[in-house]
């Protein structure tokens, strides 16, 4: 109508998807009677009647709003439930009397997108790519209106940069009317980006104001050529023979190049390639002194066939040679003296110690052991230990046996053995002396002899217990060039009352045991012969 004032801006009503919008008809009493109002929705400039108010009573018109509209506030407010993005439009109320006026409401609909889902390029990014590559994608699902995306690297927003950074965003409309935003970050990365943290942020608005959601932080696999190659040895510190040693080749490129490890040959002055495991690690197990030498690593880029060489690394496997003792098999008369000398070579300074074998008692610190006024008891083992004090566990030993000339010496002079008649008895007798003695028995039986060491012998005799044997006992006699000696074994019948409850079975064993190394005892075992019938 000419001269009519411009339409005022519609009232803004903001609401979240799924909630209820309250559309209050803002007509004053002078502009129209609120008991007689028509409500319209305006879409693409087309008005559609959606609701009528007559005498304060509401009536929905058939159509998309039929089930979702109701009157509130004594007819002044139209309530629209279950708001969807499609409801974002202008609604107007029109009073009928005294003259037709209308009031417009702009409904704005909002929905927060879901948490952004960030995906990293699963193949990684080479630094030498000619163009920006797809680094990561960010997807924000089911937001309304379309959220804004910002990409961050190490906490700083990324800006478009020609030929360096390109952000490509697109959106799709779901059947619900909500938007799914996909943003692709394309960039040319550099080696330093291997540790960079990327994330995306979705900015969106709700009736309550501006909000944002952040994705998780991700790192991107970055591929870059090797510039430096080096060797690492494990364990660190001083190495010794017997250790498990790993020589590992390392490079600063990603992916790691193909490695080969070589060792300088001192005689030919040429490097010889060593056999590494699948990971390019040379394992020396056990390490030997021959493994000492100069090692180098060569790294190959299989694409370019360019190779890089590491700084050489000197490897020293510390060792102690076999220990030599002189004299190697000493023999001495009682009362004489003896000097034992120990020698060994090592890659480090050595310490020597002499120990008595039987007691582990330290006799001397140094390579020479002097023994004077030798007694028979001085016979036996002496151990020289050559060790490197600066490398725990690096030592070698050599045992030498000293023989003192003398007649046989019995482990025991006499002893009692408990027996039962008709048992097979296992008797033992031990003697020592130099020269090594032989042992004989005064009764018939099966005898067997075994060397305990060069000066000591153990004889065992299997014999049937008879009344005569119980009468006489058993003697063993040891003899050598320098004399003879005898031990007596007295046989005593077992009193049945001394037997334990479970030892009266037909297969029971009764054993009397003592260490053959102690000078007072020996071992005897009796075994009952199988009987023709068992006793109940």
């Amino acid at each position: 109508v000419p001269g009519e004032a411009e339409q005022p801006a519609p009232e803004l009503v903001e609401v979240e998807v799924g909630s209820t919008a309250l559309l209050k008809c803002g007509l004053s009493q002078s502009q129209g009677n609120l008991s007689h109002v028509d409500w319209f929705s305006v879409h693409k400039e087309k008005r559609t009647l959606i609701f009528r108010v007559r005498q304060g009573q509401g009536q929905s018109e058939p159509g998309e709003y039929e089930q979702r509209l109701s009157l509130q506030d004594r007819g002044a407010t139209l309530a629209l439930t279950q708001v969807t993005p499609q409801d974002e439009r202008i609604f107007l109320c029109q009073g009928k009397r005294p003259r037709s006026q209308e009031y417009r409401i702009q409904l704005r609909v909002y929905k927060a997108p879901e948490e952004p889902n960030i995906q990293v390029n699963p193949l990684g990014i080479p630094v030498n790519s000619k163009e920006p590559e797809e680094v990561a994608t960010c997807v924000g699902r089911n937001g309304y209106p379309i959220p804004q995306v910002i990409w961050y690297k190490n906490g700083r927003p990324l800006k478009e940069e020609k030929n360096r950074v390109h952000i490509q965003s697109s959106q799709t409309v779901e059947s619900s009317g909500l938007y799914t935003l996909q943003s692709i970050l394309k960039a040319q990365l550099v080696k330093e980006d291997k540790d960079a943290q990327f994330y995306c942020e979705l900015n969106y608005r709700l009736p309550s104001g501006n909000h944002m959601k952040e994705s998780r932080e991700v790192t991107v696999p970055v591929f870059y050529p090797t510039e430096k190659v080096w060797l690492e040895v494990e364990p660190v510190g001083m190495l010794k023979e017997g250790d498990r040693v790993e020589i590992r080749c390392l490079a600063d490129g990603n992916p790691p190049p193909h490695f080969s490890i070589s060792k300088g040959n001192p005689s030919t002055r040429e490097a010889e390639e060593e056999t590494t495991n699948d990971n390019g690690v040379l394992v020396l197990e056990p390490a030997r002194k021959e493994h000492s030498g100069r090692y180098e690593c060569q790294a190959w880029n299989l694409d370019t066939m360019i190779s890089l060489l590491s700084e050489p690394q000197e490897l020293l496997v510390n060792y102690v040679s076999d220990v030599r003792v002189s004299p190697a098999a000493p023999e001495r008369q009682e009362g004489s003296s003896l000097t034992l000398t120990c020698e060994a070579e090592s890659s480090q300074d050595l310490e020597f110690q002499w120990l008595r074998e039987e007691t582990d008692q330290v006799l001397e610190r140094g390579p020479v052991l002097q023994l004077h006024d030798l007694k028979r008891e001085a016979g036996g083992g002496y151990r020289c230990v050559a060790s490197v004090p600066s490398i725990p566990g690096l030592n070698r030993t050599q045992l030498v046996k000293l023989a003192i000339f003398g007649p046989p010496w019995m482990a025991f002079k006499e002893r009692k053995v408990w027996v039962k008649e008709n048992m097979v008895l296992n008797l033992s007798c031990e003697a020592s002396g130099h020269p090594r003695p032989t042992i004989s028995w005064n009764v018939n039986g099966t005898a067997s002899e075994g060397d305990q060491d060069p000066q000591r012998v153990l004889s065992t005799l299997n014999v049937l217990v008879t009344p005569e044997l119980l009468e006489t006992g058993v003697e063993c006699t040891a003899s050598n060039d320098l004399g003879k000696n005898t031990s007596i074994l007295f046989l005593e019948l077992v009193n049945l009352t001394t037997l334990t409850p479970d030892s009266n079975t037909t297969t029971g064993l009764s054993t009397s045991t003592a260490s053959p190394h102690t000078r007072a005892n020996s071992t005897s075992t009796e075994r009952k012969l199988p009987e023709p019938e068992s006793r109940g």
Epitope: Q119, E134, T137, P221
Partner: antibody, heavy 116, light 106 residues
Amino acid sequence: QVTLKESGPVLVKPTETLTLTCTVSGFSLTSNAVSWVRQPPGKALEWIAAISSGGSTYYNSAFKSRLTISRDTSKSQVVLTMTNMDPVDTATYYCARHRPFYFDYWGQGTLVTVSS
Amino acid sequence: DIQMTQSPSSLSASVGDRVTITCKGSQNIYKSLAWFQQKPGKVPKLLIYDANSLQTGIPSRFSGSGSGTDFTLTISSLQPEDVATYYCQQYYSGYTFGGGTKVEIK
């Protein structure tokens, strides 16, 4: 619409080199990466190699020394060569488009038999 | 390399049944998982990407769920045309496929 079509020999002899071509339409090789995937008869799918929209190449480490992937953007073609073929390489070979990291369109596949 | 283990390797169900296929990753792959359908003698067809997003044109009876290492493909009401082998694929680090699940009608 988006299409991918594989072409190449159906039969190769052991130790020979296989060359397969994937011709694409409906998108640009400078916008999307393309992968090669194979499937031996009655078995599962196995990724072989890819070339990115920027031209970077990637290979399955199991075959890396035998593979080369390249592209000719003017012809909209991606080429895969696989050396030293073996009867175990008998499979249907597919090319597939990345969108951007998953495979949304596949070629119809070409069955390659390795036999003497 | 990331391994993807699918179970079961095969199943038989009646038309209208709800069918569930699982896929387990050897490490956390977040939501970098796709599901493909391959009918006998045909090309693999993308059903689901980003673990739970339905590819355009795929019937809504297909749905995907899961995150991290455990994922599920569900067919809410099995149809005769769903007879196929289904593969999961991770794209978190490189590309690896599951061994496949063959779905048949009883």
